[in-house]
Interface confidence: low
Amino acid sequence: MACLGFQRHKAQLNLATRTWPCTLLFFLLFIPVFCKAMHVAQPAVVLASSRGIASFVCEYASPGKATEVRVTVLRQADSQVTEVCAATYMMGNELTFLDDSICTGTSSGNQVNLTIQGLRAMDTGLYICKVELMYPPPYYLGIGNGTQIYVIDPEPCPDSDFLLWILAAVSSGLFFYSFLLTAVSLSKMLKKRSPLTTGVYVKMPPTEPECEKQFQPYFIPIN
């Protein structure tokens, strides 16, 4: 639940003045309200794509009308917390991360769509979304429970030289196979045609006298 954060300019922070909105909410809603933070929601688990890109939504329940918001992505792994990226944006404008940042993002109302790229298996961890309402006062801070991002490295491609050898071997094999097949086929064809090609042509006398000058060849097969 979101209540009051601590104020930068109004320094007096006694409990009575800080918690009356919560007390009011308590009586209105009959639920316990803790006045320490602004609520930040984010998905529990996200699986990065094969190209090492992970996207998730970071949503915060803004208690006031903030005009300047700072979003920070923290990575927690092995009890160490490191800052992944951070961006400050004016409400209604785009998020601008540093040029060398691995993060990109867009904002829509109280939602921030974050994309982290260039992830590898070793980057698997809990990615925490931290939201700060910077301006106008009071200053609010909210920290999400974190999104566990799993990154699985794609199977490495075999060596290009090795691939060339495989390609050469396969194509050579196919060539010799086709050559052999052609040779066998030709030999079989020749064997089948052999009775038709062994014979002599002889001149036969005409059967009719008027066709004296016309000779019809007749084929005599020789066994």
């Epitope: 954060g5 601590f6 930068r8 320094a11 007096q12 922070l13 006694n14 409990l15 800080r18 320490k36 933070a37 920070t72 923290l74 927690q76 009890s79 160490q80 917390v81 800052e83 951070a86 700060e132 910077m134 200053y139 801070l141 920290i143």
Partner: nanobody
Framework: QVQLVESGGGLVQAGGSLRLSCAAS????????IGWFRQAPGKEREGVSC??????YYADSVKGRFTISSDNAKNTVFLQMNSLKPEDTAVYYC????????????????????????????WGQGTQVTVSS
């Protein structure tokens, strides 16, 4: 009025000890993480040690030599500095920031500049610690 008042600084020989105190007032002590920071001439302010409901944090350079503790009833945080070295010479500041950035969730995190102290924390005026060789 929020106030953080440091005391206990001074001149000490290398190998000596000092105990710094930070008295806080004007806010609910339990809601904040209190840290000790130092700034040597020409250098950036750095986190030395922090304490919150989640636990304690020490910079690598002071581990085993400095001890942070608190007396919640008196809203006071102490920094016991033993085996002091000349490189510990600096102005020591006491800072307070929302304990949401607790050691429990962010080990050492709330002692760094990125976690709210510098822009939104409360600061004392500082106390000079000089270690002579």
């Amino acid at each position: 009025q929020v106030q953080l008042v440091e005391s206990g600084g001074g001149l000490v020989q290398a190998g000596g000890s000092l105990r710094l105190s930070c008295a806080a007032s004007g806010f609910t002590f339990d809601d904040y993480a209190i840290g000790w920071f130092r700034q040597a001439p020409g250098k950036e302010r750095e986190g030395v040690s922090c304490i919150s409901s989640g636990g304690t944090y020490y910079a690598d350079s002071v581990k085993g030599r400095f001890t942070i503790s608190s007396d919640n009833a008196k809203n006071t945080v102490f920094l016991q500095m033993n085996s002091l070295k000349p490189e510990d010479t600096a102005v020591y500041y006491c800072g307070a920031v929302s304990s949401l950035l607790s050691v429990e969730r962010f080990p050492g995190g709330h002692c760094g500049p990125r976690y709210g102290y510098y822009r939104h924390g409360y600061w004392g005026q500082g106390t000079q610690v000089t270690v002579s060789s």
